[in-house]
């Protein structure tokens, strides 16, 4: 699986989740956040050819397309597969609101 | 929605489904399929701007992330969202054989 | 500019519900919340609750969380508050609104939407 | 719910003079973080509210000096070291310190 501990152990140069971390300040302008500052969100990264972890029946005969295209602009594209929530503190009046937002970590990635 | 109703009768420039015509034999070495002899697979391409069809929190999240850190290679990525099968026939010895491939054609795309 | 759209009048008959949009524009919409507070004449102004486009994070006041709903579309730029159940204690302008956070100042409003509620 | 007075209700001045409007809060407004998240609004007829002073004395972005807020705990003031013709109109206390948050009654400042 190119999961984060595959992919951070090694100099994959194919699509894997990479290391990313959002300042919610900074990167999104989210000021009312209170905990935490910010967050390894990571991303997906690299090329997709023929047989690497493609995700459906498309993607595999998009690979192969493209194999025997190599100048052709479809191609499948490394994204997201297992994205994890984030625990948030912010408040609203004087009362801290603990949030489990979803989807927020990418865990790993699939050619799709 | 990013669908071939609406992509193939717009100019859109960012992401949507394309046209695309693969033909078994010269595109992928199939010489097994008897009909069709190729399908319109299509592929999505475009950019993944901020709030164009955003499929989860995170990719909101990096979208904005991207407006705010324009140089980045972090970036959502088009990929396909609703994918139909294609019937094929093919031979088994002297008996034709017809068969449903699962998700071989892109109806539309989404930024993931 | 920040603009913050709504339409201007809505008749409903009471016991029915109705839906609002407020349109943003001229800013980055999933960076900030919209507020909804409503303004009856001679009662003053009354918050209603907040959304965070970016998150779908809500809060209420109590006293609207049976009869106020707040949802978002991030792809039109667009908030909605729906009311149910409606009365003739609920004919009020209803403004949406930007603010940074829960806690921040509202810096921007709608130009509000008149809910008549008659039969 | 915390209460906001405001007095007077209405402010009869001549153009040129200071007005100094009251907003008087029933449980302090400080906040465990060390914020006073009182703020002041003016609202003209036909018009929505405008921001005038966010957090006790912060001047909102195009706001001409002659505007100022002060206070503390419970007690606050807006001033207007020279009133204009078109400072006219409704002015509003409110806070978000506590839920729910609540606005005052208003403060008509009209010509004498």
């Known amino acids: 699986a190119l999961d984060t501990n595959y992919c951070f152990s090694s100099t994959e140069k194919n699509c894997c989740v990479r290391q990313l971390y959002i300042d919610f300040r900074k990167d999104l302008g989210w000021k009312w956040i209170h905990e935490p500052k910010g967050y390894h969100a990571n991303f997906c990264l690299g090329p997709c050819p023929y047989i690497w972890s493609l995700d459906t029946q498309y993607s595999k005969v998009l690979a192969l397309y493209n194999q025997h295209n190599p100048g052709a602009s479809a191609a499948p594209c490394c994204v997201p597969q297992a994205l994890e929530p984030l625990p948030i503190v912010y408040y609203v009046g004087r009362k801290p609101k603990v949030e489990q937002l979803s989807n927020m970590i990418v865990r790993s990635c699939k050619c799709s | 929605a990013l669908d071939t109703n609406y992509c193939f009768s717009s100019t859109e420039k960012n992401c949507c489904v394309r046209q695309l015509y693969i033909d078994f034999r010269k595109d992928l070495g199939w010489k097994w399929i008897h009909e069709p002899k190729g399908y319109h697979a299509n592929f999505c391409l475009g950019p993944c701007p901020y709030i164009w069809s955003l499929d989860t929190q995170y990719s909101k999240v990096l979208a904005l992330y991207n407006q705010h850190n324009p140089g980045a290679s972090a970036a959502p990525c088009c990929v396909p969202q609703a994918l139909e099968p294609l019937p094929i026939v093919y031979y088994v010895g002297r008996k034709p054989k017809v068969e449903q491939l699962s998700n071989m054609i892109v109806r539309s795309c989404k930024c993931s | 500019q920040v603009q913050l759209q709504q339409p201007g009048a809505e008749l409903v008959k009471p016991g029915a519900s109705v839906k609002m949009s407020c349109k943003a524009s001229?800013?980055?919409?999933?960076?900030?919340?919209i507020t909804w507070v409503k303004q009856r004449p001679g009662q003053g102004l009354e918050w209603i609750g907040d959304i965070f486009p970016g998150t779908g994070s809500t809060n209420y006041n109590e006293k609207f969380k049976t009869k106020a709903s707040l949802t978002v579309d991030t792809s039109s730029s667009t908030a909605n508050m729906q009311l149910s159940s409606l009365t003739s204690e609920d004919s009020a302008v209803y403004s949406c609104?930007?603010?940074?956070?829960?806690?921040?100042?509202?810096?921007?409003w709608g130009q509000g939407t008149s809910v008549t509620v008659s039969s | 719910d915390v209460v906001m007075t405001q007095t007077p209700l209405s402010l009869p001045v001549s153009l040129g003079d200071q007005a100094s409007i009251s907003c008087r809060s029933s449980?302090?407004?400080?906040?465990?973080?060390?914020?006073?998240?009182l703020h002041w609004y003016l609202q003209k007829p036909g018009q929505s509210p405008k921001l005038l002073i966010y957090?006790?004395?912060n001047r909102f972005s195009g706001v001409p000096d002659r505007f100022s807020g002060s206070g503390s705990g419970t007690d606050f003031t807006l001033k207007i070291s020279r009133v204009e013709a078109e400072d006219l109109g409704v002015y509003f206390c409110s806070q978000s310190t506590h839920v729910p948050f609540t606005f005052g009654s208003g403060t008509k400042l009209e010509i004498k």
């Open positions: 609104a930007r603010k940074l956070g829960p806690n921040y100042a509202v810096d921007y």
């Open positions: 957090k006790l004395s």
């Open positions: 001229g800013y980055i919409f999933t960076s900030y919340w």
């Open positions: 449980q302090s407004l400080i906040h465990s973080h060390g914020n006073t998240y």
